[in-house]
């Protein structure tokens, strides 16, 4: 009986070892299949829509990255509260797993749009450098399913790049007008979102806890209408120290108001940036190294 029990234990240990080996092989096979599939799907630089089929839905780009898909491009995601899936660009560089929520690159899209467009999202969801706004509804679904870090990549017309990063980026729902909440800042571009660059201007320049405004839905703290004057939808205060949805100009500009693509703490109010990428990833993101 004792021999039988020992033999049972030995066989169990062997089974466990075999299970581990099979699992490792499965992971390797999956990785190779995915690499093969993605290479097949990567039809050049411009159109980067990647169809993974309906095998599995993903809640954000970090899940896609950690499932072995390492190619940047447009994928379909469905956050927890979201009633439907939607397309988003996943940036699998810079550590990987970034869900791109906004992009400005060339002024090809009109960002002077109304509440419904900003709520649902608009723009080019096909091309790698296509400009878009993911949609406030989708931002809400994304940022209430996990703690996210917002990273903003900025570039000017003189080939300089800076970034700003905020922990715990949150967007409220339609009932509280997609209110913005951000946490601790880090980066090289300066803290234009929370307006911490100067205590005296914070009361009117900070975007923290501001509701979203568009030309047809004014929720700012200004007697006039910031969105109308600045020709974009944004979390305006009275009015802004950052407006990444502003009018696309080529660098320094003159206009009735500071309505360009502005990040005050880097280039001030009268310089419109060349490119912007706003992207999010879970605070505690750990790449799955297979």
């Amino acid at each position: 009986l004792e021999d039988c029990a020992q033999e049972q234990m030995r066989l169990r240990a062997q089974v466990r070892l075999l299970e581990t080996r099979v699992k490792q092989q499965q992971v390797k096979i999956k990785q190779l299949l995915q690499e093969n599939e993605v290479q097949f799907l990567d039809k050049g630089d411009e159109n980067t829509v990647i169809d993974l089929g309906s095998k599995r839905q993903y809640a954000d780009c970090s899940e896609i990255f950690n499932d072995g898909y390492k190619l940047s491009g447009f994928y379909k995601i469905k956050p927890l509260q979201s009633p439907a899936e939607f397309s988003v660009y996943c940036d699998m560089s810079d550590g990987g797993g970034w869900t791109v929520i906004q992009r400005r690159s060339d002024g090809s899209e009109n960002f002077n749009r109304g509440w419904k467009d900003y709520e649902n999202g608009f723009g080019n969801f096909v091309q790698k450098h296509g400009e878009y706004w993911l949609g406030n509804k989708n931002l809400h679904f994304l940022t209430t399913q996990e703690d996210y870090t917002l990273k903003i990549d900025l570039a000017d017309f003189e080939k300089n790049s800076r970034y700003a990063q905020y922990k715990n980026f949150k967007v409220g729902d339609e009932k509280n007008f997609y209110e913005l909440n951000i946490g601790e800042y880090s980066g090289t571009a300066g803290d234009s979102l929370a307006g911490n660059f100067h205590p005296e201007v914070q009361w009117w320049a900070s975007h923290q806890r501001m509701k979203f405004s568009t030309w047809d839905r004014d929720h700012d703290n200004y007697e006039g209408n910031c969105a109308e004057e600045d020709q974009s939808g944004w979390w305006f205060n009275r009015c802004h120290s950052a407006n990444l949805n502003g009018v696309y100009y080529s660098g320094p500009y003159t206009a009735k108001t500071d309505n360009g693509i502005v990040w005050y703490t880097w280039h001030g109010w009268w310089y419109s940036l060349k490119s912007v990428v706003m992207k999010i990833r879970p605070n505690d993101f750990i790449p799955n190294v297979i």
Partner: antibody, heavy 116, light 107 residues
């Protein structure tokens, strides 16, 4: 540490109403949805609905639309569920939960007994 | 509503044994499935999310897998604290729905 602390057991008469609570701690209450779930004695689980504390927005399982009212008090980080026109069918343990992508936290449950 | 059919409804097993529970979804849920454990004292804990990802702090003897519309929870070697009730939960669409549960008992 995230915690959801639910109120104690309730014994209520048929036809009456009861309001049970779920006090959140260890995180910013207004950031995340709170869901409610029902479990009848010795039976399985049923989803009742959710509330988003940031705005008070709610959504219900059709089955509980006229039964459960979900509210929050952000000043005390507490979610409430009021059950009305109680019958023996409402005798159950009610759970609140915070369900995120990478974590889920459940309250310990509140037993509501409907008896004459 | 999506129906989740869980089997078996009860299961007797010995310590060290390997067991599997299954849930079948009546519609496509694309991997939006969790496995929950309810202890005899009523406390509930999520073990697995997205069909196969282990929640933080959950022992590695638990694993989740999927084959089409069938989702499985496997415990590779049962320990005394694993004897409890287990439920699957689909969160692909509202209303969220649960499997009927599996009572896992000591043989």
């Amino acid at each position: 540490e995230v915690q959801l602390q639910q109120s104690g057991p309730e014994l209520v008469k048929p036809g009456a109403s009861v309001k049970i609570s779920c006090k959140a701690s260890g995180y910013t209450f207004t950031d995340y949805y709170i869901n409610w779930v029902k479990q009848k004695p010795g039976q399985g689980l049923e989803w009742i609905g959710w509330i988003y504390p940031g705005s008070g927005n709610t959504d219900h399982n059709e089955k509980f639309k006229d039964k459960a009212t979900l509210t929050v008090d952000t000043s005390s980080s507490t979610a409430y569920m009021q059950l009305s026109s109680l019958t023996s069918e409402d005798t159950a343990v009610y759970f609140c939960l915070r369900f995120l992508l990478r974590s889920a936290y459940w309250g310990q449950g509140t037993l509501v007994t409907v008896s004459a | 509503d999506i129906q989740m059919t869980q089997s078996p409804s009860s299961l007797s097993a010995s310590l060290g044994e390997r067991v599997s529970l299954t849930c079948r979804a009546s519609q496509e849920i694309s991997g939006y499935l969790s496995w929950l454990q309810q202890k005899p004292d009523g406390t509930i804990k999520r073990l697995i999310y997205a069909a196969s990802t282990l929640d933080s702090g959950v022992p590695k003897r638990f694993s989740g897998s999927r084959s089409g519309s069938d989702y499985s929870l496997t415990i590779s070697s049962l320990e005394s604290e694993d004897f409890a009730d287990y439920y699957c939960l689909q969160y692909a669409s509202y209303p969220w729905t649960f499997g009927g549960g599996t009572k896992l008992e000591i043989k």
